[in-house]
Each structure stands twice: as structure tokens, then as C-alpha cells.
């Protein structure tokens, strides 16, 4: 029985500025370079030590970037991701998704790049919820010795 | 993880060709950016081309001379060397990165670019 890899979700709005070498990190997708399945979005595969992106410590490699100075990055070809990368200008405003994952149950194997998964609170709620009447069931138990 | 290993290095004389191949580890090798790069004797490391998901660049000193080219079904880049020169005379190195730059391609003339790099191939002209 393979466990889900669960992640929560958050959106962020990190304003750049272009340094002496650039923005300094990479980028994986696109709608002819699918990194992840079922997803052509633009993901940051690496950021460069002490780079402009680095620097400022928002971003995170494995974060998908949702927009550049507005712009939506839906089905776009990943070298014309890369190019309005590089001529968004000087002061560079990204839209990103951050991924923070948590793994439940068992270990399983999930394909490199997969973010699929549920939101955290979904499975926090019902274990908090247990987890009270669990205890409110002890104590009234122990009322009773 | 990604390995890289190298072949096709060896003696050739002035004027002739060889083709570089470095065979890389990974299900994700078509989203990497590759590179080679040589050092000769009592030299620093020196960028000689490299090859992203549609670009490509080239040093000055083999420009017209080398191509860098990219098999993403034999997760394999290769580096045709022709009209080869003393000059040329080095341990090739293969190198390889995630993704592509959304800087300037010329980034990737810089070793610092890269996180994974093969154990290089002789190359003499003689």
C-alpha cells in the first residue's frame, strides 16, 4: 500500500531585481517540455548562489511560477517562457506557487516532478478531530475508576 | 542524481575529427542543460560549447568547427570536433545542469553553472 505525498499550497507575489548577471535561477516546462505530468507550467529548477533570486531567499527550486510582470505563463512554449524571462526588465514581478511537502503512511514511490496530492488541512482536520475524542473518551473513562 | 560518463577521446592528427559522446543517467534528461568544457595541461578549465532545450552556444575558438548536438532518446550530447588543431589538445569534460538559464545563454560559459560533471575524455592533436 503505497502512502500519499500531501501538499500545502500557498501563492506569493516576489518582486526581483535584476542583478549584475541577471535573475539568476533555471526553469523546467512547458507545453513541449512537460516536467510534470499533466502540468506544462514553469517550474525553477535551480538558483544560483548568490544570484538575484538567491539574495533575496523568496524563491524555492520546485516552485511554479504563475506569472512575470503580469503576464500568465499557461501554455507557453518553454524557450518563450525563457524569453520573457529575459526581457521582462530590470525590476521583475513573479506570481509563484510554493509546494511544501508533507508525506503520510507508508513511503511510496511517486514519479519525479509529480505534485499531486491533497490540501493538509484535509487530513490535519480529521486527525485533530479524533485525536479530542479520543481524549475527551480517557478522561471520562478515568472519572469513572 | 545525474552521471555523466564520456567517450570518444583520443589521438587524431592535425586536421582531423572526432565525435565526443557523453552518456548521462536520469528520466528527466531532456530538461537538462549540457556543456562541454576542456582543460589542457598547466590551463584553467575553458568553456567549448554548450546545448540547452533549443539553444545552442559555442566559444569563439571552435566556432564553425565543433557542434554540439543532443539525443534526449539516448540521453546522450555529443561534440563533433573537426578541423582539429594542436590547440585543441585537452581532457574534455561533460557537464550538465537542470533547466535553462532565464538569463543570458551567455551564463553557461561559466563552470559555476553546472552541478554535474563527468571524469573526462583524452583528446591529443598531433
Known amino acids: 500500500m503505497n502512502g500519499r505525498v500531501d501538499y500545502l499550497v500557498t501563492e506569493e507575489e516576489i518582486n526581483l531585481t535584476r542583478g549584475p548577471s541577471g535573475l539568476g535561477f533555471n526553469i523546467v516546462g512547458g507545453t513541449d517540455q512537460q516536467y510534470v505530468s499533466n502540468d506544462s507550467g514553469i517550474y525553477v529548477s535551480r538558483i544560483k548562489e548568490n544570484g538575484a533570486a538567491a539574495l533575496d531567499g523568496r524563491l524555492q527550486e520546485g516552485d511554479k511560477i504563475l506569472s512575470v510582470n503580469g503576464q500568465d505563463l499557461k501554455n507557453l512554449l518553454h524557450q518563450d517562457a525563457v524569453d520573457l524571462f529575459r526581457n521582462a526588465g530590470y525590476a521583475v514581478s513573479l506570481r509563484v506557487q510554493h509546494r511544501l511537502q508533507v508525506q503520510n503512511g507508508p513511503i511510496g514511490h511517486r514519479g519525479e516532478g509529480d505534485p499531486s496530492g491533497i490540501p493538509i488541512f484535509m487530513v490535519l482536520v480529521p486527525v485533530f478531530a479524533l485525536t479530542m475524542v479520543a481524549a475527551w473518551a480517557f478522561m471520562r473513562y478515568r472519572q469513572q475508576l | 542524481d545525474v552521471q555523466l560518463v564520456e567517450s570518444g577521446g583520443g589521438l587524431v592528427q592535425a586536421g582531423g575529427s572526432l565525435r565526443l559522446s557523453c552518456a548521462a543517467s536520469g528520466r528527466t534528461f531532456s530538461t537538462y542543460t549540457m556543456g562541454w568544457f576542456r582543460q589542457a595541461p598547466g590551463k584553467e578549465r575553458e568553456f567549448v560549447a554548450a546545448?540547452?532545450?533549443?539553444?545552442?552556444l559555442y566559444s569563439d575558438s571552435v566556432k564553425g568547427r565543433f557542434t554540439i548536438s543532443r539525443d534526449n532518446a539516448k540521453n546522450t550530447v555529443y561534440l563533433q570536433m573537426n578541423s582539429l588543431k594542436p590547440e585543441d589538445t585537452a581532457v574534455y569534460y561533460c557537464a550538465a545542469v537542470q533547466g535553462s538559464p532565464v538569463d543570458t545563454i551567455v551564463v553557461l560559459t561559466t563552470s559555476e553553472e553546472y552541478d554535474y560533471w563527468g571524469q573526462g575524455t583524452q583528446v591529443t592533436v598531433s
Open positions: 546545448v540547452t532545450w533549443s539553444e545552442t
